[in-house]
Interface confidence: low
């Protein structure tokens, strides 16, 4: 899977799409979660309803909320309020029983605000010592990460 | 009508490779899950793996990693199994199996099956 | 893996009459969006197996009225109200609720 960047600006919110195949993923539950290191494991954040039927009904964990729709075969993920603390790299993922199908690889990037008062080209990626609690943040800007760029950069 | 038909028996030494051919017609062989079970001789049936030919997903049993590759051509709607450092326990008809689908959710269930395919592993 | 055990391994009937076999699994078969993929194939003497239950109680279309399927969580029944002659042969409960998929050993139906 290739890795897609959705940036927002600090304090706004950013809402990140996941286009699937309604037919393969017929019947299953989605989830977001947050990627714990280049090879480490996806933490949960929030998941679709447990009735899959329902599943276009809209569930929160704090400021993230996840939707589906199961027909069109769009999973859309809002984040509220985007902090610093939230860039990093995330996936969504179709659940099988205890398998997890990735739908697409996702790297959350936050502009800062430029009515703030620091420099308005600072931003913010994933850190070697960012903790990953519970992502907080939905859609501005996309693209996918050009060929030879480096999703997890190395570790000194 | 759905239906799936396999390649002919074949007699193989030990430590070589079996492709095993299933021809899908009747559906839309790009959007369902093909299966591959096999039982040995007088043995219950073993899950081996499946495919996913819109996109080329797979997933294998255990038992079988590093040893089959299941793969789909969706131009001629055919799936492959191919078993590799064959050895006499491998002795055993070979069948692809569709999922079912039901709305709503996917049932899961292999509704149709190959005739099977017979692979004798002797030396 | 989930271990699938059916109970008893072979079962001989007289025709008109009813038989019984039950499935267990290691772990709980209900699947995070609510279903359960237990399923029920007959494998008639010679030929490739069939499937004669989907989901627990759902029967295949072609499948007489006299098969039934019930249960829940890790204990699952197939019930056959009157068996006939064409019944058969090697009956397998399966599960695709987690990969990989597996199934029972098998009962063998016989006719007395």
């Known amino acids: 899977h290739n890795t897609t960047v959705f940036q927002g600006v600090e304090g706004q919110s950013l809402q990140v799409s996941c286009p699937y195949d309604s037919m393969k993923h017929w019947g299953r539950r989605k989830a977001w979660c947050r990627q714990l290191g280049e090879k480490g494991p996806c933490q949960r954040v929030v998941s679709t309803h447990n009735l899959w039927l329902l599943s276009f009904l809209r569930r929160r964990n704090g400021s993230t909320a996840i939707t589906d729709d199961t027909l069109g075969g769009t999973l859309t993920i809002t984040l509220r309020n985007l902090q610093p603390h939230d860039a990093g790299f995330y996936q969504c993922q179709s659940l099988h029983g205890s398998e997890a199908d990735t739908l697409r690889k996702v790297l959350v990037e936050v502009l800062a605000d430029p009515l703030d008062h620091r420099d308005a080209g600072d931003l913010w990626v994933p850190g070697e010592s960012e903790s990953f609690e519970d992502a907080h943040v939905e859609h501005s800007i996309s693209r996918s990460l050009l060929e030879g760029e480096i999703p997890f950069p190395p570790t000194s | 009508q759905v239906q799936l038909v396999q390649s002919g028996a074949e007699v193989k030494k030990p430590g070589s490779s079996v492709k095993v051919s299933c021809k899908a017609s009747?559906?839309?062989?790009?959007?369902?899950?093909m299966n591959w079970v096999r039982q040995a001789p007088g043995q219950g049936l073993e899950w081996m793996g499946r495919i996913y030919p819109g996109d080329g997903d797979t997933n294998y049993a255990q038992k079988f990693q590093g040893r089959v590759t299941i793969t789909a051509d969706e131009s001629t709607s055919t799936a492959y199994m191919e078993l590799s450092s064959l050895r006499s326990e491998d002795t055993a008809v070979y069948y692809c199996?569709?999922?079912?689908?039901?709305?709503?959710?996917?049932?899961?269930?292999?509704?149709?099956w190959g005739q099977g395919t017979l692979v004798t592993v002797s030396s | 893996d989930v271990v699938m055990t059916q109970t008893p391994l072979s079962l001989s009937v007289t025709p008109g009459q009813p038989a019984s076999i039950s499935c267990r699994s290691s772990?709980?078969?209900?699947?995070?969006?609510?279903?359960?993929?237990l399923h029920w194939y007959l494998q008639k003497p010679g030929q490739s197996p069939q499937l004669l239950i989907y989901k627990v109680s759902n029967r295949f279309s072609g499948v007489p009225d006299r098969f039934s399927g019930s249960g829940s969580g890790t204990d699952f029944t197939l019930k056959i109200s009157r068996v006939e002659a064409e019944d058969v042969g090697v009956y397998y409960c399966s599960q695709s609720t987690r990969v990989p998929y597996t199934f029972g050993q098998g009962t063998k139906l016989e006719i007395k």
């Open positions: 772990q709980s078969l209900v699947h995070s969006n609510g279903y359960t993929y």
């Open positions: 009747g559906y839309a062989f790009s959007s369902s899950w």
């Open positions: 199996a569709r999922l079912l689908r039901n709305q709503p959710g996917e049932s899961y269930a292999m509704d149709y």
